[in-house]
């Protein structure tokens, strides 16, 4: 397995919150005798080997911050201790894991390392790490909110925002689909009895329209945009492109979106069949996401 860092640099103003993210990909042994630990620690720049030195994050060691997975277990961490220090580590079933740091200060600036350790029964560890830098700024030069810059291997050669690596798209869309479908199914029995219109069914994925333009040499990634809902017909369009294996790179990560997909419009909120059709469209799209992404 390997660890990927989507961003190599995060620039944030003081007082802001930031979430640093890594992702595990590649073959992962899920045997009953294998345990995985995912954790975070600080390190120093200018080492021969990045992340070879380790230091605590806000006085918490890597063991305080770790997420522990047994063969088929969900992750858990010493949640309360971390939260008291304004930290929270999290992990999902798509290989993403992150650390959220609240109320940043200048002291939080530095090199952060995410680490995945595999341990087989009675054996030592196999470990892989990723590194990223956090710069906390104050004063007039500080951005109004956090800006993330892509890792060099994923930087676009053009001056514009770079496209997301395919695994990031899959990861974001898969988790969004899971949340959307489960949320929708949980609401669906009430839709027939309740006279008020059901809430709109939205799949939130990052949109490039909110990108922060930067004078820096490498511009922020398209992945750092805020969430934006997709209109109903765009589900099928995005799903079909994803299924065809085209790596999305423009506004909705869909190549030639203008030819195929309608411009951004408010999602359907109508009752009855409209809502059911939209649910069907979401389902078709999400099935294509799961199928396509499972091939990664």
């Amino acid at each position: 397995f390997k660890v990927a860092t989507l961003y190599s640099l995060y620039v944030c103003p003081e007082g802001q919150n930031v979430t640093l993210t890594c992702r595990v990909f590649g073959p992962v042994d899920k045997g009953h005798d294998v345990t995985f630990y995912k954790t975070w620690y600080r390190s120093s720049r200018g080492e021969v080997q990045t992340c070879s030195e380790r230091r605590p994050i806000r006085n918490l060691t890597f063991q305080d911050l770790h997420l522990h997975h047994g063969g088929h277990q969900a992750a858990n961490t010493s949640h309360d201790l971390a939260q008291r220090h304004g930290l929270e580590s999290a992990s999902d079933h798509h290989g993403n894991f992150s650390i959220t740091m609240r109320n940043l200060t200048l002291l939080d600036s530095g090199l952060y390392c995410c680490l995945v350790v595999e341990i087989r029964h009675h054996h030592s560890e196999h470990r892989v790490h990723g590194a990223m830098e956090l710069q906390v700024q104050t004063g007039k030069d500080a951005p109004s909110s956090c800006v993330a810059y892509p890792s060099s291997s994923q930087e676009s050669e053009s001056k514009g925002p770079s496209s997301c690596p395919f695994w990031v798209i899959c990861s974001l869309l898969s988790s969004s689909c899971t949340q959307t479908l489960f949320g929708t199914l949980a609401l669906s029995p009430q839709a027939h009895r309740n006279p008020s219109p059901p809430p709109p069914l939205l799949l939130h994925i990052p949109s490039a329209s909110s990108l922060v333009q930067s004078p820096e040499a490498h511009s922020p990634s398209i992945c750092s945009g805020v969430s934006a809902p997709l209109a109903s017909l765009e589900w099928l369009c995005l799903g079909s492109h994803l299924w065809l294996g085209k790596v999305p790179h423009d506004r909705y990560w869909v190549p030639q979106a203008a030819k195929c997909c309608p411009s951004h419009q408010p999602p359907m909120t109508s009752e009855g069949w409209g809502s059911r059709i939209q649910l069907l469209q979401i389902s078709v799209f999400c099935v294509s996401v799961f199928l396509r992404c499972s091939l990664l």
Partner: antibody
Framework: QVQLKQSGAELVRPGASVKLSCKAS????????INWVKQRPGQGLEWIAR????????YYNEKFKDKATLTVEKSSSAAYMQLSSLTSEDSAVYFC??????????????WGTGTTVTVSS | NIMMTQSPSSLAVSAGEKVTMSCKSS????????????LAWYQQKPGQSPKLLIY???TRESGVPDRFTGSGSGTDFTLTISSVQAEDLAVYYC????????FGGGTKLEIK
């Protein structure tokens, strides 16, 4: 630079106890395991136990479980090993050593200066 | 526990000569997930603490002269000193760190 400095030589009576110290400098003490290794005169190296200073959790070689007790003092970046019910078999040089593991085992990249313990009446 | 056996227990060579010493483990110290051998070599000079020379069976620690070379895989390992110097007088230990920690009995290198 990274260093582990150990306390001076000890001469102790049989049946007594002794507490050895290992003071770390040049790195984040809480984030690396400290191991203790025994070397009897003219003999090889034997791993006793290790401790993670950040949590104070210690892990022992079964053979030394009733002999050694490890503790740490984070404020002074010091690790300690107490040896109890001493016999002539415990006469040895004791080393502390840092290992670079996170959750498993690892090689020892830094060694302490060593403390000679002599048990004699 | 994995047992480590070193041979010979001692050897004497002249300065400039090549020397090899062996270390055998009772079971493989190769980790299948990363294909690394969890074996290190240490040098202990008279009256001093051990010093890390080699880890992962063949990776030289920074600052260690390139006349020291580690090789082998699985259960059989070798430490080679290509041209022995007077300052290499020491006991050399192998150490497995795949499953807990065990050391070999050591090989004492003497200079003729």
């Amino acid at each position: 630079q990274v260093q582990l400095k150990q306390s001076g030589a000890e001469l102790v009576r049989p049946g007594a106890s002794v507490k050895l110290s290992c003071k770390a400098s040049g790195y984040s003490f809480t984030d690396y395991y400290i191991n203790w290794v025994k070397q009897r005169p003219g003999q090889g190296l034997e791993w006793i136990a290790r401790i993670f200073p950040g949590s104070g959790n210690a892990y022992y070689n079964e053979k030394f479980k009733d002999k050694a007790t490890l503790t740490v003092e984070k404020s002074s970046s010091a690790a300690y090993m107490q040896l109890s019910s001493l016999t002539s078999e415990d006469s040895a040089v004791y080393f502390c050593a840092r290992d670079d593991s996170f959750y498993g085992y690892w090689y020892f990249d830094v060694w302490g200066t060593g403390t000679t313990v002599t048990v004699s009446s | 526990n994995i047992m480590m056996t070193q041979s010979p227990s001692s050897l004497a060579v002249s300065a400039g000569e090549k020397v090899t010493m062996s270390c055998k483990s009772s079971q493989s110290v190769l980790y299948s997930s990363n294909q690394k051998n969890y074996l290190a070599w240490y040098q202990q000079k008279p009256g001093q603490s051990p010093k890390l020379l080699i880890y992962w069976a063949s990776t030289r620690e920074s600052g260690v002269p390139d006349r020291f070379t580690g090789s082998g895989s699985g259960t059989d390992f070798t430490l080679t000193i290509s041209s022995v110097q007077a300052e290499d007088l020491a006991v050399y230990y192998c150490h497995q760190y795949l499953s807990s920690y065990t050391f070999g009995g050591g090989t004492k290198l003497e200079i003729k």
